[in-house]
Interface confidence: medium
């Protein structure tokens, strides 16, 4: 922010009433008036270029120093050119001094060189040529020099002429200010201009109404520098919540609008399925029905648990079921459903029921499920099986209700047995197998049926209690088709995928491969 | 010596015109302001015109303003006034007067200036 | 415009007599103040310009002070050749203008 000038003296502005002081007394610098612009100025002007050894005073009234430590000066002057008079004029000067004494008390009339202190020898960066003398163009140089530090109750200025032919229009003293500021919706007060050069005050900033330091931050600070401009700004404030910052204050958020937190975002308006706010309000109710999950930011609308899944399918394979469903019609708003299935068995025989989840196998963990389908497994066969799927999103468990749906299904087979081949040789071939635990009761016999590939006329077939057997009398090096299945007292259980296994050729008949 | 020399004047007929002119010698005529200023007989005198160094700018009093017309030649050292629209009232003595502004000991001048060296005047009478 | 009003309009006065002629202006002109001596049948003379300050090769006796509205021309021991007309001129504005002159006659 630029630096605020409290004017201490101005010679311009005082429309010639501040009679200073000359000295000698009636010789060398004058008060004259001129005409500018078609108004009139006046000007304190010397011009005693013929004569040498000039040594002409002129002094300020008292000027009362009050706050200032470093007070600035600055001048408005012409020079004229020394070669505009006739013969060159050589004893005369282009430049006059500046002095400055500090005091107590107002001396008066008694002017006392030796207590002047020069401060500079001030110079023109233009000087006033003939013509531009002639033509009347004033060609105003403006030099400032600063002082500091001030201890005293007041000073003067001096402004020594060596014989020179010069004019100040203007002198004007002044110390500088960094003014009130807000910054970063904090307040920070007007404050003196410090003296020296390399030093900063350090001032504290009060946030304004309805604001506060942000947790963590730092509290709010500037420097005023000695040309009183606001430097290295730290820290800041933030509206508190339910305030939004507009221009440099903090205003309550409006009616149907709300902010949460202390931040620097504005008020946002309610979400969807809330009820009105009111004035400088940090959150939104929600209607009813309607809810907020603790982790959902308060600009997300508000939500319902979903509806149940919309369609459901249980398809069963053997042992298998595949459970196939679509998601709800009413998402609730959310897009974090989560499915969970749970199993229920049922005896035919004896129509108890009871849960099934330790006895059955899922393809990924039921509960959390994200993907519309599962496939169940383990499942034993000639029981009456029922699939509960339930719809849950993060607003579920907010509620006592739940969404779902029940498929059920009956399983008659077994579950196709899992086939491998043990050994080989050039004759014989050795096929293992293994169907759940949990069927295994329910098997009668296994029947293997084989043949040659290529050959469909005829197959062999063989029945064991076990779970293998060897097949011999086979032909070497040769490719057969065999199959699996458990028979039940029911009739039979699904068969196993046809295994193609080969006999090995005479040459490796020293090895049996595994 | 400075010696300015007017000539031009003699009688005219109201409405009619005339061309004064002032041929200057001894003295740098292109430092100096150069001015007409006339006297009605037996009056007081009158600021009439005024030209700067290098021909510029130009200050008319009210009452030739529109009708007079100040012009210098730098280099023929002559200042000039053609005068328009003749009317009894410009009946005067006119003189052409100077200013060297290097003689005045002032750090600033004044807006307007005062008249260092005169010529002997030329008559314009204005009668029907 | 500015205007200059001298007094008084003519004055009789012997010669080694001093002899104070005022002109006053009808606002502030500082010191932009000249003043001339004109003989009859001649052009006008400058005396003083800057209300104070002798042209070069006017004689002493003659002098001039004052400012802002007050001002005056005084010749210490007049001398015959001084009988004539004095003017005073304002050249603080652009429209110069000259007061109505004194006339200082032998007594």
């Known amino acids: 922010a630029q630096g605020k000038e409290v004017v201490l003296l101005d010679f311009a502005a005082a429309g010639g009433e501040l009679g200073w002081l000359t000295h000698p007394y009636g010789k060398g610098w004058d008060l004259m008036q001129n005409i500018m612009n078609d108004m009139p100025i006046y000007m304190y002007s010397v011009c005693n270029v013929m004569s040498g050894d000039q040594d002409n005073w002129l002094r300020t009234n008292w000027v009362y120093r009050g706050e200032a430590e470093r007070i600035f000066i600055e001048l408005k002057f012409t020079v004229r050119d020394c070669n505009s008079f006739p013969g060159g004029a050589s004893s005369c000067k282009e430049t006059f001094n500046l002095y400055y004494a500090e005091s107590d008390l107002d001396y008066g009339t008694n002017f006392q060189k030796r207590l002047f202190t020069k401060i500079d020898t001030i110079a023109p960066d233009e000087i006033t040529v003939s013509s531009d003398f002639e033509a009347r163009h004033v060609k105003l140089n403006v030099e400032e020099r600063s002082v500091g530090p001030l201890t005293r109750k007041g000073f003067y200025l001096a402004f020594q002429d060596i014989g020179a032919c010069v004019a100040l229009l203007s002198v004007r003293v002044y110390y500088k200010k960094c003014p009130e500021l807000l910054q970063s919706l904090a307040r920070f007060p007007e404050t003196i201009a410090g003296s020296d050069a390399p030093s900063l005050a350090t001032v504290a900033g009060t946030c304004v109404d309805h604001a506060v330091v942000p947790p963590g931050g730092e509290e709010p600070r500037m420097h005023c520098a000695v040309d009183g401009e606001w430097l290295v700004p730290i820290g800041q404030c933030l509206c508190q919540a339910g305030y939004e910052k507009v221009e440099d204050a903090c205003q309550a958020c409006s009616p149907g609008f709300f902010k949460f937190e202390v931040s620097e975002s504005p008020c946002l308006e309610c979400p969807e399925h809330t009820l009105p706010s009111p004035e400088g309000a940090t959150s939104c109710e929600c209607e009813e029905g309607f809810f907020r999950a603790p982790q959902d930011p308060m600009s997300m609308p508000c939500t319902r648990p979903p509806s149940a899944p919309h369609y459901l399918t249980a398809v069963g394979m053997g042992a298998k079921v595949e459970l196939r469903w679509t998601p709800p019609q009413d998402s609730g708003g959310r897009e974090d459903i989560v499915y969970s299935v749970t199993c229920e068995q049922c005896w035919p025989e004896s129509g108890e029921c009871g849960p099934c989840e330790s006895s059955v196998r899922y393809s990924e963990p039921p509960h959390g499920l994200t993907r519309t389908s599962v496939t169940v497994s383990d499942l034993e066969p000639h029981m009456n099986y029922t699939f509960t799927v339930e719809a849950r999103n993060g607003v579920s468990g907010l509620v006592t209700s739940r969404s779902f749906r029940t498929a059920s299904v009956s399983i008659n087979q077994t579950e196709p047995p899992k086939v491998r081949l043990e050994g080989r040789s050039t004759t014989s071939l050795s096929v293992s197998w293994s169907i759940p635990p949990p069927q295994q009761s329910r098997v009668w016999k296994y029947e293997v049926t084989y043949r040659k590939k290529g050959d469909s006329n005829s197959y062999n077939v063989r029945r064991t209690e076990g779970f293998s057997v060897t097949l011999d009398d086979l032909a070497p090096d040769t490719t057969y088709l065999v199959q699996v299945q458990a028979l039940t007292q029911e009739g039979q259980g699904a068969g196993s995928k046809v295994h193609e296994f080969q006999t090995l050729s005479p040459e490796g008949s020293g090895s049996l491969a595994v | 010596e400075v010696q300015l020399l007017e000539s031009g004047g003699g009688l005219v007929q109201p409405g009619g015109s005339l061309r004064l002119s002032c041929a200057a010698s001894g003295f740098t005529f292109s430092h100096y302001m150069m001015a007409w200023v006339r006297q009605a007989p037996g009056k007081g005198l009158e600021w009439v015109s005024r030209i700067g160094p290098s021909g510029g700018p130009t200050h008319y009093a009210d009452s030739v303003k529109g009708r007079f017309t100040i012009s210098r030649d730098n280099s023929k050292n002559t200042l000039y006034l053609q005068m328009n629209s003749l009317r009894a009232e410009d009946t005067a003595v006119y003189y052409c007067a100077g200013y060297d502004s290097g003689y005045d000991y002032v750090a600033v001048a004044g807006p307007a200036e005062y008249f260092q060296h005169w010529g002997q005047g030329t008559l314009v009478t204005v009668s029907s | 415009d500015i205007q200059m009003t001298q007094s008084p309009s003519s004055l009789s006065a012997s010669v080694g007599d001093r002899v104070t002629i005022t002109c006053r202006a009808s606002q502030s002109i500082s010191t932009w103040l000249a003043w001339y001596q004109q003989k009859p049948g001649k052009a006008p003379k400058l005396l003083i310009y800057k209300a104070s300050n002798l042209h070069t090769g006017v004689p002493s006796r003659f002098s001039g002070s004052g400012s802002g509205t007050e001002f005056s021309l005084t010749i210490s021991g007049l001398q015959p050749d001084d009988f004539a007309t004095y003017y005073c001129?304002?050249?603080?504005?652009?429209?110069?203008?000259f007061g109505q002159g004194t006339k200082v006659e032998i007594k």
């Open positions: 001129q304002q050249y603080n504005v652009y429209s110069r203008t």
